[in-house]
Interface confidence: medium
């Protein structure tokens, strides 16, 4: 949404000089029962790839109907295809479920591109490769959609894992994760490890490939290296966070940090790209172009419209810069940074015409609804959505794609002053358009 009035932006709020570090309070968070350790049954329970989303197998109804469900931290409805559609191999058949209850209420969800409508009901839901529980959850049975389901994506519904505030038709519709926590002993936390392929996958490879893990109720140490660093959830609607500084190859973009969060910054597994506000996008692209100037790329590449290809195995990763986002830390005046590689922000795609080549799309794009840390960011990290403590944790993913020279990183602490001023306060209007 374009706002007619923009609040005055403060300048000079960048991070302190690198190297000035604050001591961490503790190296690791204290152990909490049921929240850490090994979750073998949940590891590798996701499939898919960043371009079409990551999905988990779920069952709905009695007897159970198995469906693949997109894991989406950027929305809050559990919605499944409930009618034939050319892109669906299967769909939820309410009439076959003895436990389905109709709520006699419709729901409509428009996105920037695409939309769906359906009817609300409740049914019994479980996750075969998740906690051994069954919950009665709200389900939006999608009866009609446009540009929502993706041909060949292999998922038939969406699991919105964000908060009730952005649920449709309103915040009275309890999201799935809230129902899960209320009805079971599952701790109020989940974590995601999305594993980008690093190379294009054809249909048969996607169906056979492992896409990552959604650990429900805990943290699995085997999925990350190094330490987990936490940033506060600013407000419980989307998973909103605050970015306090942005660097391209260590060079500060030197923008008023409010710009980075205009009008919000969210962590969204249902979005492919790293999406940046217009001004930030323009500055970032200018800086990335300058850093990679040894090769010239068409304008369409930077707009995400054109592919660039190199002979198989010769992609010049080294000419592309790393990108660091500094996030507000849990301690006053302390931040930490997450750093991604071109292996994350150049998305491999298959170019039928030149199948011998390695082709990529630039997976950073412009946004009019704030920063969206989509799959290209998340694929570098193990991300902990610690709802109980209102914070999001980042650690280097054990499955992220890198080369022998550089790796994704999560590092801190750094001194950053006046970080609260980096948050943008959205004027109190109806923010329920769910634009993604």
């Amino acid at each position: 949404t374009q706002h007619g009035i923009r609040l005055p932006l403060r300048s000079g709020l960048g991070g302190a000089p690198l190297g000035l570090r604050l001591p961490r309070e503790t190296d690791e968070e204290p152990e909490e029962p049921g929240r850490r350790g090994s979750f073998v049954e949940m590891v590798d329970n996701l499939r898919g790839k960043s371009g079409q989303g990551y999905y988990v197998e779920m069952t709905v109804g009695s007897p159970p109907q198995t469906l693949n469900i997109l894991v989406d931290t950027g929305s809050s409805n559990f919605a499944v295809g409930a009618a034939p559609h050319p892109f669906l191999h299967r769909y939820y058949q309410r009439q076959l479920s003895s436990t389905y209850r109709d709520l006699r209420k419709g729901v409509y969800v428009p996105y920037t591109q695409g939309k769906w409508e359906g009817e609300l009901g409740t049914d019994l839901v479980s996750i075969p490769h998740g906690p051994n529980v069954t919950v009665r959850a709200n389900i939006a049975a999608i009866t009609e959609s446009d540009k929502f389901f993706i041909n060949g994506s292999n998922w038939e519904g969406i699991l919105g894992l964000a908060y009730a505030e952005i649920a449709r038709p309103d915040d009275s519709l309890e999201p799935f994760f809230d129902s899960l926590v209320k009805q079971t002993h599952v701790p109020n936390l989940f974590s995601l490890q999305l594993c980008g392929a690093g190379f294009p996958l054809n249909q048969s490879e996607v169906l056979a490939s492992v896409g990552g893990s959604m650990i429900i109720g805990g943290i699995d140490h085997s999925l990350y290296t190094g330490s987990l660093w936490y940033t506060p959830i600013r407000r419980e609607w989307y998973y909103e966070v605050i970015i306090v500084r942005v660097e391209i190859n260590g060079q500060d973009l030197k923008m008023d940090c409010k710009e980075y969060n205009y009008d919000k910054s969210i962590v969204d597994s249902g979005t492919t790209n790293l999406r940046l506000p217009k001004k930030v996008f323009e500055a970032a692209v200018k800086s990335i172009k300058a850093a990679s100037s040894t090769e010239k790329f068409p304008d369409g590449f930077w707009l995400g419209e054109q592919l660039v290809c190199w002979q198989a195995g010769t992609t010049p990763w080294n000419i592309f810069p790393v990108i660091s986002l500094y996030l507000m830390g849990e301690v006053t005046n302390q931040s930490f940074r997450i750093t991604i590689l071109p292996q994350q922000y150049l998305r491999p795609v298959e170019d039928v015409a030149t199948s011998q080549d390695d082709c990529y799309k630039f997976a950073i794009s412009q946004s009019s609804t704030g920063t969206v840390m989509g799959a290209v960011i998340m694929e570098g990290f193990y991300v902990v959505f610690d709802r109980a403590r209102k914070r999001i944790g980042f650690a280097v993913s054990a499955c992220h794609v890198h080369d022998e020279f550089r790796t994704a990183a999560v590092e801190g602490p750094f001194v950053t002053l006046d970080m609260e001023d980096c948050g943008y306060n959205i004027p109190q209007t109806d923010e329920s358009t769910l634009m993604t």
């Epitope: 009618a83 009817e119 009609e144 389901f149």
Partner: antibody
Framework: EVELMESGGGLVKPGGSLKLSCAAS????????MHWVRQAPEKGLEWVAY????????YYTDTVRGRFTISRDNAKNTLFLQMTSLRSEDTAMYYC???????????????WGTGTSVTVSS | DIVMTQSQKFMSTSVGDRVSVTCKAS??????VAWYQQKPGQSPKALIY???YRYSGVPDRFTGSGSGTDFTLTISNVQSEDLADYFC?????????FGAGTKLEIK
Amino acid sequence: EVELMESGGGLVKPGGSLKLSCAASGFTFSDYGMHWVRQAPEKGLEWVAYISGGSNFIYYTDTVRGRFTISRDNAKNTLFLQMTSLRSEDTAMYYCARRAYYGSSYWYFDVWGTGTSVTVSS
Amino acid sequence: DIVMTQSQKFMSTSVGDRVSVTCKASQNVGTNVAWYQQKPGQSPKALIYSASYRYSGVPDRFTGSGSGTDFTLTISNVQSEDLADYFCQQYSSYPLTFGAGTKLEIK
């Protein structure tokens, strides 16, 4: 039994208006997208307009866009077609028809009403 | 718009015969084609959807075939009650379009 019954047709002068209704029974009306299809005398079938179950998806054929408005009242199980700026070429039998399955795959018409006749003539 | 062409306006057949009604799309529509029967003074009824799937309650003497641009409705063992107009329809893209119809006459 699944039934659709149109009403509201009649004789109207060019430039005039008419509102057609279609009463549905025997199925959960809000689950289904609904169409209007017309058939000029001794002619073939022509699709006119479509409205989805929740009224969020609405489509028209080019010749009626801007003149006709499709709507529905799910509480009353009724479909409407408001026709304005009528022309002689709008003369036809107007059928309401149910969209099969209410899913995005099958855009054929599985149940048809008996039709209501509209004549536009001076 | 996709044009659906039914080249035969009329077809004459006898009870017990087999008859094929054809329909050609102006561009590829996959299998997104339906066939309807309209008896004199009545509204149309669905016979076939997705080019070859028989609608529930339709006698198995009606079969549909084809994909892409060429489609056929075949009526084997024609009965007197099959006297009707037959229309094809594409639902591959908007606007939804019909063929002009083929009138089946029984000798």
